[in-house]
């Protein structure tokens, strides 16, 4: 189970001194900023017990690993249920503190219930302030049942649950009727998964037989201590004032664990710490009781004496929970409760016994969880004790489970259990991804997603070139951080793979999909200059450049001419992918516009220095559109246009041009230059008869205006074919022939 | 469907007995506390009888107390009532209801009747 | 037992009116108060619980208010359907009382 614990400090004369804390002693727990580890949280939950809102609670981490609730400023804040998440991925878990009002009108007589898979259980609400009314039940915040007052037996309501389920599992409070919710008795139901003694998906394996109230869970076969013992079966008890999967946290405050309540992953829930019991857990236990709540007997046997935090403390000569074992019946020594191992490896596991006989190396064997015995293959005898080692053949996931070291002699018999946790090393599941590159180097990101079990200790980052066989190069870096890939050859793909490793021995994995690398191309080093330019139109500019010698061949593939607009603030660019060109003609250039023109080699992505810049001045755009655009047929073959000159020209107008096509025609139109300016009609010959045309024209400046509208006319029927359009003018406002 | 389904009612001469009974479905039966309601021909509603879940506790209307028994059997989601010693003034409709508790706006219970069965008519008449 | 006190005992009004039917109890019962309607021929049917608490599935036309003795179920705006009887139900004890009933009647 993950080592988590929520605290709830119950001295309750001011409430604005009562805190939460949750605890972790999960390795890198709640570092929350990095991949590995998800941050501790602590709240309020407000989804089944509501309470008037109040001021925002405080929440303060004390470093990495310890997360403090506080302000608490009226006693009802302190009302209702509380909340603490730790583990990362499928080790997440929830631990629940529920708070009950000392001064409701009901209390549980105790608030967490853990019951099996099929168990009856009661809750039972003492009347504290006694109201005539009804008493309802609810179960996470939905009516669940009703009792009358007068049905209250010995001053409790009682809820009976027969058969209860997992989905039973839950928040129930008694409330009566007329009273305010906060006056209400909470409880907590945890209903574990199986029935009594057993664990897995169908139930079929057995508990470890956890001692001191400890609590197995259904999923794992894991003892859940509780505070103030360790072992794989609780059967240690830590010093006073210690707490945590390893005892290694230490109550707060000069009276040790006095008024504190400890809340840990189900299927526990909630106790006082060991040696204190009572509803705010400021009692001691009374004598020859112990544990948490006080609610183990110590039954001392052999002269033994009963201490309230750890139970039996044995003279010498005798050992065991009540002292009732001799020392001259062997014991196993010193045994961890829980060893890891990485997957196919094959460890030593030493077991150590003592007793009178003492063990030998025949005497002491090891049983898998499959019921497989292994012998010691050598043994370590020294005056105090006998350690046996054995070697253990290459594991497998089924191995994981609880095993057993024994030891037999003529004195009797010893047995450890002990949990043993086989983790497959990480896989990653992605390739690095690539940040950067340049030309000698790639900066790579190592950090992905992995398959199989963290932490993760060490990440090796592994490339070559691609299509290489020579050795891969090896970079062992910080899984955090990203990595610079240093002296690469330039242009260059690079098969890179992360390989990730865990603790232990055989803890690394298998390599990572490789993914492919491309280092960038050199530089180009070379500057072009602008040998000249000129305009060919309105919006079309020639740019010639050149290059200086250097031996060797050149590096480039192309060049980029770059046009700045600075008066609309707009860049244009001009790819020419040829290193060996001098010359681009731009067209499609903005007319009348000032434009800063430059030149720069560039190698796949990267770009050569500029050439100094040009200052270019484009003429103006041509002139507007002539205006009142008409046609008349006058024969078979020969159409008039008259129009009228454009308006607002921004000088004299060089020519007219007249487009002819055939109405619905598919063949190119045909362009007629009309080169006196001055006229305003023109007669277009040499047409087909019958045949309907479109016009359209449109005047010359320096560069060619906008056109026309486009009129439609058909010449007069019964002619004979054309040669094609011919073209004759006249200025209609002197009506002279042409 | 949630339903209340009474049946039973029917004429009877005064100081005669009558059964009703009320069948329930759609519901968890056994966790609601039930009441039987009378309505004289014409008349309003009047409160008869009521019965907790456990049917450990019962309350009657003065106008009854001493000759109606209510009564459930949770196993068979059935309400009954034991009508002895009638009068005239029994003649009505009797209405089995189902009372639920719910939350106010300010978090606490309020209570009420908010399920019906059709009724059952009682005639007590010589 | 607590004494329900309902008025008026009928009312005529039309579609569209706003309509107002007091209930006063004989002693406190905060807002333990209940309204129902019943048609002709039909079980009772809850509208409103703990005094102005509105049931799932009942128009928003109907609305309740008062604390103490003094409550009042309102229809803002009247609607065929709402032609029936309405009574007025104390929770606040065991003995669970109800009004005489107020009928409203089309006019």
């Known amino acids: 189970a993950v080592d988590l614990t929520l605290l709830a400090n119950l001295r309750l004369t001011d409430p604005q001194r009562f805190f939460l804390t949750c605890v972790s002693g999960e390795a890198g727990a709640g570092r929350g900023s990095d991949a590995w580890g998800p941050p501790l949280l602590l709240e309020k939950d407000d989804r089944i017990v509501r309470t008037p809102p109040g001021p925002p609670l405080r929440l303060a981490r004390n470093g990495s690993h310890q997360v403090t609730l506080r302000g608490f400023s009226k006693p009802s804040d302190l009302v209702g249920v509380f909340s603490c998440v730790g583990g990362a991925g499928a080790r997440r878990t929830r631990v629940i503190y529920v708070h009950n009002s000392p001064g409701a009108h009901l209390l549980p007589d105790k608030v967490t219930h853990t019951v099996n898979k099929g168990d009856t259980a009661v809750l039972s609400a003492r009347v504290h302030k006694e109201k005539q009314t009804d008493v309802i039940w609810k179960s996470n915040g939905s009516y669940f049942y009703t009792l009358d007052w007068h049905e209250a037996q010995d001053g409790r309501f009682l809820l009976q649950l027969p058969n209860v389920q997992p989905p039973s599992s839950g928040i129930y409070s008694a409330t009566y009727l007329e009273a305010s919710p906060l006056g209400s008795a909470f409880f907590r139901l945890i209903v574990r998964g199986c029935g009594a003694g057993r664990w897995g998906p169908g139930c079929t394996k057995e508990c470890p037989g956890c001692l001191h109230g400890g609590v197995c869970h259904d999923h794992d076969g894991e003892c859940v201590c509780p505070p103030g013992f360790t072992g794989t079966r609780c059967e240690q008890a830590c010093r006073e004032g210690r707490f945590g999967q390893s005892c290694q946290e230490q109550c707060p405050g000069i009276s040790g664990c006095r008024g504190l309540t400890f809340c840990l992953p189900d299927p526990y829930g909630c106790s006082c710490g060991s040696g204190w019991r009572g509803s705010q857990c400021q009692e001691a236990c009374a004598p020859g009781h112990f544990g948490a709540d006080c609610r183990l007997q110590c039954q001392c046997q052999n002269g033994g004496t009963c201490d309230r935090f750890s139970g039996c403390v044995c003279p010498s000569g005798w050992h065991g929970v009540h002292c009732e074992k001799s020392d001259r019946i062997p014991q196993i020594l010193n045994m961890a409760s829980e060893l890891e191992f990485n997957l196919e490896t094959m460890p030593r596991i030493n077991c150590a016994a003592a007793g009178n006989p003492f063990p030998v190396r025949g005497s002491i064997e090891l049983r898998k969880p499959d019921g497989t015995v292994l012998l010691s293959t050598k043994a370590i005898v020294e005056p105090e004790k006998t350690t046996a080692e054995f070697e253990v053949p290459r594991l497998v996931l089924a191995d994981s489970g609880f095993w057993e070291c024994r030891v037999s002699t003529s004195g009797g018999q010893d047995s450890r259990r002990f949990k043993v946790n086989v983790k497959v090393p990480p896989v990653p599941l992605a390739a690095p991804r690539l940040l950067t590159k340049q030309s000698r180097q790639l900066v790579v990101s190592p950090l992905v997603s992995f398959s199989g079990d963290g932490p993760i200790s060490t990440v090796r980052l592994h490339y070559r070139p691609q299509d290489s066989t020579m050795d891969w190069s090896t970079i062992v870096v910080d899984p955090s951080e990203n990595v610079t890939l240093m002296n690469l050859r330039p242009k260059t793909g690079y098969s890179v793979r992360v390989q990730l490793s865990r603790p232990g021995e055989g803890g690394e994995g298998a390599w990572g999909p490789p993914t492919l690398m491309t280092t960038d191309c050199p530089e180009p080093l070379l500057q072009p200059w602008l040998e000249g330019w000129h305009v060919e139109g309105t919006d079309r500019l020639r740019v010639s450049w050149s290059l200086p010698l250097v031996p060797g061949p050149l590096v480039g593939d192309g060049f980029l001419l770059r046009l700045w607009d600075g008066t609309r603030g707009q860049e244009r660019r001009e790819n020419v992918s040829s290193p060996q060109a001098r010359t681009a003609l731009l067209t499609g250039l903005t007319p009348g516009t000032h434009y800063q023109l430059d030149v720069q080699l560039y190698h796949c992505t990267l770009l050569g220095p500029a050439s100094p810049p040009a200052h270019v001045l484009l003429p103006p755009s041509g002139p507007p559109a002539p205006r009142h655009l008409h046609a008349q047929a006058l024969s078979d073959s020969e159409i008039q246009l008259t129009w009228k000159h454009p308006e607002a020209l921004p000088g004299p107008i060089s020519k007219y041009v007249v487009e002819v096509q055939v109405a619905g025609g598919a063949g190119d139109p045909l362009w007629i230059d009309v080169d006196r300016p001055e006229e305003t009609s023109t007669i277009i010959r040499g047409l087909n008869a019958s045949t309907r045309y479109l016009f359209r024209m449109r005047a010359s400046i320096q560069g060619l205006g906008d056109w026309s509208n486009t009129v439609e006319e058909s010449t007069l029927g019964n002619g004979l074919q054309a040669e094609g359009p011919v073209q004759e003018s006249r200025a209609a406002e002197e009506g002279l022939d042409q | 469907e949630v339903q209340l389904l009474e049946s039973g009612g029917g004429l009877v001469q005064p100081g005669g007995s009558l059964r009703l009974s009320c069948a329930a479905s759609?519901?968890?039966?056994?966790?609601?506390?039930m009441q039987w309601v009378r309505q004289a021909p014409g008349k309003g509603l009047e409160w008869v009888s009521s019965?907790?879940?456990?049917?450990?506790?019962?309350y009657y209307a003065d106008s009854v107390k001493g000759r109606f028994t209510i009564s459930r059997d949770n196993s068979k989601n059935t309400l009954y009532l034991q009508m002895n010693s009638l009068r005239a003034e029994d003649t009505a409709v009797y209405y089995c209801?189902?009372?639920?508790?719910?939350?106010?706006?300010?978090?606490?219970?309020?209570?009420?009747?908010?399920?019906w069965g059709q009724g059952t008519m009682v005639t007590v008449s010589s | 037992d607590i004494q329900m006190t309902q008025s008026p005992s009928s009312l005529s009004a039309s579609i569209g009116d706003r309509v107002t039917v007091t209930c006063r109890t004989s002693?406190?019962?905060?807002?333990?108060l209940n309204w129902y309607q019943q048609k002709p021929g039909q079980a009772p049917n809850l509208l409103i619980y703990?005094?102005?608490s509105l049931e799932s599935g009942v128009p928003s036309r109907f609305s309740g208010s008062g604390s103490g003795t003094d409550f009042t179920l309102t229809i803002s705006s009247l609607q065929p359907e709402d032609f029936a009887t309405y009574y007025c139900?104390?929770?606040?004890?065991?003995?669970?009382?109800f009004g005489r009933g107020t009928t409203l009647e089309i006019q």
């Open positions: 002693q406190s019962i905060d807002t333990y």
């Open positions: 759609g519901f968890t039966f056994s966790i609601y506390k």
């Open positions: 209801a189902r009372q639920t508790y719910y939350y106010d706006s300010s978090g606490y219970f309020r209570n009420a009747f908010d399920i």
């Open positions: 019965i907790y879940p456990s049917g450990g506790a019962t």
């Open positions: 139900q104390q929770s606040y004890t065991t003995s669970y009382t």
């Open positions: 703990g005094a102005s």
